[in-house]
């Protein structure tokens, strides 16, 4: 049979996924009902690996399957009559497929830094990069992340800095390629703890007895993590800046000369069954030397005739030592002083001078 | 075939609100961050707001701040943009487009916005 | 804020000539550079961004370069469909910027 050439293809129109594009097209000729059509589909850069797919018969649409994420392809499609007569042009268009969403993403604290580390391995096919969206309330912030090669498996991170500590922030990674986005993967993670800032004041101190004083002190700034505990710490020395160093100091060893700095009293402030708010200041009033126990600290009677200065450790993490029991690590703790209190200067105990005066 | 259609623009008075809006298709709307960029006649390019897929964080040149608020309804395919507090300085052709990695890839007709007495 | 500084504001080229277009940001913006054309009436059209070496349906005759705070458009062999008022922009940090334009005539 003799047949005319088919006039060209117009029209097409093509719906993508992640691996597949779904073409349809048009041909306007009388005979067109008896075409197939033939259609080479070419990955951008790659024109030795070409796709066909032929059609069945008056079929103008066709599936394209097993391509690559976020990647460019060209198809030509010729309209083809009886023996292989085809259209002088292929009708041709350029598509994307869309680009694969990130499977998931890990956050990690960075230790004493209100940062975050994020990290991923690259979602299938070809990208341009990646949006980040980092919120928190009403704060946010929206960056670039450069492009990755999901060939070798290869884990990649970045680091999110200049957050604040002890924070829920959401988290959205969104893939870009061939000017589409992904949809975005989402996650909630929240920043790590430091040292509480230390406060601006220091603690009240007043002679009770001869041998007992009450301590009065505001709790800590709770913006570098939620406060665990608090220490009240004696000295009778020159107060200089307290270290983490005097925490492992006890009644005991002031007794016995070992130091004449030592912890007399501890709090546990989960203790006190509510949480905390950024704003919400406790006031706290300890009676010191009245021989409680608290964990490995003794809060024993004073000199009288003493001289006593009080200052109060913070801790945001309390790490107790594995051979100490229940004395403070303060390497291993996070942890931040006050200044120490002005001096107290205890009286005589009048029952001993009485005593005396009498014999 | 992507298509972004804006509508709302017309003539305001100083002072007086409007709001925009721009009706998306033929793609996932959901998954993109778009924006608004506008063009005072004769003049060039000013970009205006713009607003995050995942958690729809929005961001404004200092100019509209406090004044003008971007949002957009995911189920609708729509994006917009309430103006308040109108100046004649806000007089332009307002388009929305996508926005991925800072680059505005597809742009709508336009509106446009006359601030006037 | 970061400034574009395009260059030339106009220029006027012959059929088949080629010709370049800069664009100077104030600071350092890691590629993320875009061009559009736009044409009288018409919204702007994304030539290329750092995203899209050349965007989808734009001719091969135009190329962009640059890194750092320099970066320019060539345009090959030009056509008379390519007149129009041509712009940079910056998506590297909020707010979004774009240069002034760049008036390109046929001769």
């Known amino acids: 049979a003799q047949y005319t050439r088919p006039s060209n293809v117009s029209n097409i129109d093509v719906s993508t996924n992640t691996t597949a594009a779904t073409l349809s097209w048009q041909n306007f000729d009388d005979a067109s009902p008896t075409y197939s059509y033939c259609l080479l589909i070419e990955k951008a850069g790659n024109s030795s690996n070409a796709t066909q797919v032929v059609t069945d018969i008056g079929i103008t649409d066709a599936t394209v399957t097993e391509l690559i994420p976020g990647s460019s392809y060209t198809v030509e499609i010729f309209a083809q009559v009886g023996d292989g007569i085809k259209s002088l042009e292929p009708g041709r268009k350029s598509f994307c497929t869309d680009p694969a969403s990130m499977a998931s993403f890990d956050c990690e604290v960075v230790p004493k830094e209100p940062a975050l580390v994020l990290k991923w391995t690259c979602p299938p096919g070809a990208n341009a990069g990646f949006e980040l969206e980092v919120s928190s309330g009403a704060w946010n912030n929206a960056t670039h992340l450069e492009s990755c090669s999901s060939e070798n498996g290869t884990e990649y991170r970045t680091e999110v800095t200049y957050l604040n500590f002890s924070t829920s922030y959401n988290i959205s990674i969104t893939t870009v390629s061939c000017g589409k986005m992904a949809a975005p993967t989402r996650n909630t993670c929240t920043t790590g703890i430091t040292d509480p800032p230390p406060p601006d004041g220091s603690p009240n101190i007043t002679s009770v007895s001869h041998n007992s004083v009450k301590v009065k002190f505001s709790g800590f700034e709770a913006s570098h993590g939620p406060i665990k505990a608090y220490a009240v710490i004696l000295t009778t020395g020159e107060a200089g800046h307290p270290s983490a160093d005097v925490l492992k100091y006890t009644y005991e060893d002031f007794k016995k000369g070992a130091s004449d700095t030592y912890v007399t009293y501890l709090i546990r402030t989960e203790e006190k069954g509510r949480s905390q708010s950024l704003s919400e200041v406790l006031k706290y009033e300890i009676d010191v030397g009245n021989e409680s126990t608290t964990l490995g600290y003794y809060n024993g009677k004073l000199e009288p005739l003493g001289s006593y200065r009080a200052c109060v450790a913070g801790f945001t993490n309390i790490t107790f030592h594995p051979q100490n029991k229940g004395l403070i690590d303060g390497a291993e703790s996070y942890v931040s002083f006050s200044r120490y209190s002005d001096a107290v200067s205890l009286p005589q105990d009048v029952a001993a001078a009485h005593h005396h005066h009498h014999h | 075939e992507v298509k972004l259609v804006e509508s709302g623009g017309g003539l305001v008075q100083p002072g007086r609100s409007l709001k925009l809006s721009c009706a998306a298709s033929g793609f996932t709307f959901s998954n993109y961050y778009m924006a608004w960029v506008r063009q005072a006649p004769t003049k060039g390019l000013e970009w205006v707001a713009y607003i995050t897929n995942g958690y729809g964080s929005t961001y404004y040149r200092d100019s509209v701040k406090g004044r003008f608020t971007i949002s957009r309804d995911n189920a609708k395919s729509t994006l917009y943009l309430q103006m308040d507090s109108l100046r004649s300085e806000d007089t332009a052709t307002y388009y929305c487009s996508t926005v991925p990695l800072g680059a505005f890839v597809y742009w709508g007709q336009g509106t446009l916005v006359t601030v006037s007495s | 804020d970061i400034q574009m500084t395009q260059t030339p504001h106009s220029l006027s080229a012959s059929l088949g000539e080629t010709v370049s277009i800069e664009c100077l940001a104030s600071?350092?913006?890691?590629?993320?550079l875009a061009w559009y054309q736009q044409k009288p009436g018409k919204s702007p059209q994304l030539l290329i961004s750092?995203?899209?070496p050349l965007h989808d349906g734009v001719p091969s005759r135009f190329s962009g370069s640059g890194s750092g705070t320099q970066y320019s458009l060539k345009i090959r062999n030009m056509q008379p469909e390519d007149e129009g008022v041509y712009y940079c922009q910056q998506g590297y940090k909020f707010p979004y910027t774009f240069g002034a334009g760049t008036k390109l005539e046929l001769k």
């Open positions: 600071e350092g913006i890691s590629n993320y």
């Open positions: 750092h995203a899209n």
